[in-house]
């Protein structure tokens, strides 16, 4: 009796179970009573990443330098090419089809995580005791100057955008 369902990595055709093609290969012809499924490898610029009965391999992604992209990992017959962005840029989306410049953290904010080719700069507000007076994609919030260690006193309080201003201690005469 012909099968109605097939095992894993098989498919049903002409009332018989044929093997799927392994990753990196495409289907050329179904199995017959005489021969196994006919599969052929994907050509150099193509891939298939699953057990399949695809008749065409997928083209490797092109990392377009005009969009700020470069190859992070070259594709194989079983994997797609992975693109990333040139320095100073990051991917606009998870699929990384184009790049945008890293954002800078404004004064009052510091860099929590420096941007990579695939993620943007993460900024955080400078907490009390820290400040940032520049717009930067690299600089963290810096601590206020400790006037005491310089044997000075705070003459002007710091903010999240400015450092404290230290000055000499007032010497009271006896």
């Amino acid at each position: 009796e012909p099968p109605t369902a097939c095992r894993e990595k098989q498919y049903l055709i002409n009332s018989q179970c044929c093997s799927l093609c392994q990753p990196g290969q495409k289907l050329v012809s179904d199995c017959t009573e005489f021969t196994e499924t006919e599969c052929l490898p994907c050509s150099e610029s193509e891939f298939l990443d699953t057990w399949n009965r695809e008749t065409r391999c997928h083209q490797h992604k092109y990392c377009d330098p005009n969009l700020g992209l470069r190859v992070q990992q070259k594709g194989t017959s079983e994997t797609d090419t992975i693109c990333t962005c040139e320095e100073g840029l990051h991917c606009m989306s998870e699929s990384c089809e184009s790049c945008v410049p890293h954002r800078s953290c404004l004064p009052g904010f510091g860099v929590k995580q420096i941007a990579t080719g695939v993620s943007d700069t993460i900024c955080e507000p400078c907490p009390v005791g820290f400040f940032s007076n520049v717009s930067s994609a690299f600089e963290k919030c810096r601590p206020w100057t400790s006037c005491e260690t310089k044997d000075l006193v705070v003459q002007q309080a710091g903010t999240n955008k400015t450092d404290v201003v230290c000055g000499p201690q007032d010497r009271q005469r006896a």
């Epitope: 055709i13 002409n14 289907l27 050329v28 012809s29 179904d30 017959t32 005489f34 021969t35 196994e36 006919e38 052929l40 490898p41 050509s43 150099e44 610029s45 193509e46 009965r53 008749t55 065409r56």
Partner: antibody
Amino acid sequence: EVQLEESGGGLVQPGGSLRLSCAASGFDFSSNTMCWVRQAPGKGLEWVACIYAGSSGSTYYASWAKGRFTISKDISKTTLYLQMNSLRAEDTATYFCARGLSRFSLWGQGTLVTVSS
Amino acid sequence: DIVMTQSPSSLSASVGDRVTITCQASQSISNYLAWYQQKPGQAPKLLIYDASKLASGVPSRFSGSGSGTDFTLTISSLQPEDFATYYCQGGDYYGSSYVVAFGGGTKVVIK
């Protein structure tokens, strides 16, 4: 019964055209690669062209066949075709249709094409 | 394009003999090689595919071996019905297209 049956061969003058057909039956035509192979009288086998019979329709040609010969298929009729133009005496051969690409697991009996004036 | 060189072009042998036919590809074709048997007035019949896999229904006296560029068809003990012409067939990608080629054939005749 699983079979391939060629037709359309015959006598044609040099420079003429001919269209060969291959009717497939007994298997799922649309999920197979189908090819034409020819054999000149008393000579060896020579690959002509192949096509994936499904929707993708990927085609493959021998370098000498490009331009003069065109392979095509009709899924609804489960039929493979070979359009041959500008025929020459050296195209005289038995033309076989076959299933497969890296191996030919099923063959028709062939149709004879004679190019002569 | 790929070229398949088959040798010998003919050989004479007796029933019971061990027969070996070789096929060389002009470039590596991995294991994508098939062997066929053809008798006069008939279509070729697939014997071996993927270099060493026996097509169903083919007697076990036929075997294939090899990979890359060098391949062999062996008939361990020649039978009367084995007198025929044998062809190898290889294929490989040429750019993004696939190209098929046959060897010139080996005619096995009775000694």
